[in-house]
Amino acid sequence: LQDPCSNCPAGTFCDNNRNQICSPCPPNSFSSAGGQRTCDICRQCKGVFRTRKECSSTSNAECDCTPGFHCLGAGCSMCEQDCKQGQELTKKGCKDCCFGTFNDQKRGICRPWTNCSLDGKSVLVNGTKERDVVCGPSPADLSPGASSVTPPAPAREPGH
């Protein structure tokens, strides 16, 4: 025997109180798949959350964050404060990157400058709090016999 509820499309629910008739989802609720016995409550974007997409009868609302904050987590489940470039967010707020580290974004952590010498390169441009160093080409690339056409770099082993 086929379940009569399986005929109820997205945007409706199978109403047990009305002989399993397909009823439209009430306001501020939705069903994104057919055959559902209840509609889900729409997400509300409040406070630091901002509505990116309104709720409809077939899809949930989508939130993002107000200016000065950025999304974290699946579906923007949290909003985290932005910092300036050259800073990272700590428990005590935004703090400048320590010497030798940088952050070129408004989010995330300060990362160490690249150590150019590990790849046999030299520093062309010094790093700042907001920018990594720029490593120059390897000395072999600069010698008189250097070819302009560079072969692909060998794949690095994981962890190197």
Epitope: C116, D132, V133, C135, P137, T150, A153
Partner: nanobody, 116 residues
Framework: QVQLVESGGGLVQAGGSLRLSCAAS????????MAWYRQAPGKQRELVAL???????KYADSVKGRFTIARLNAKNTVNLEMNSLKPEDTAVYTC??????????WGQGTQVTVSS
Amino acid sequence: QVQLVESGGGLVQAGGSLRLSCAASENIFSFNAMAWYRQAPGKQRELVALITGDGTTKYADSVKGRFTIARLNAKNTVNLEMNSLKPEDTAVYTCAALRNSDRTSWGQGTQVTVSS
């Protein structure tokens, strides 16, 4: 590997101007810097100018005040404007894409000859 195609080289009289252009096959923001190098016959390739992702520029002392490097982000292109050219600027000019985590990518180069 990114493809870099240079254009704009040629023969020019001392005191003249040229604009070199380097078109990249991928987003130039993915590189730590874009640069122009030059190499005269029998000499080592030397840095002429570079521009970083945040627009910081660096020039060889010998070209300061005469050459200007600029990015056209929408076109993934880097230009080198060369004014008051001197015979000693004669060289093959090559565009380079510098990525700290990888080997430098080079274009094929374009010849610039400055006659006196």
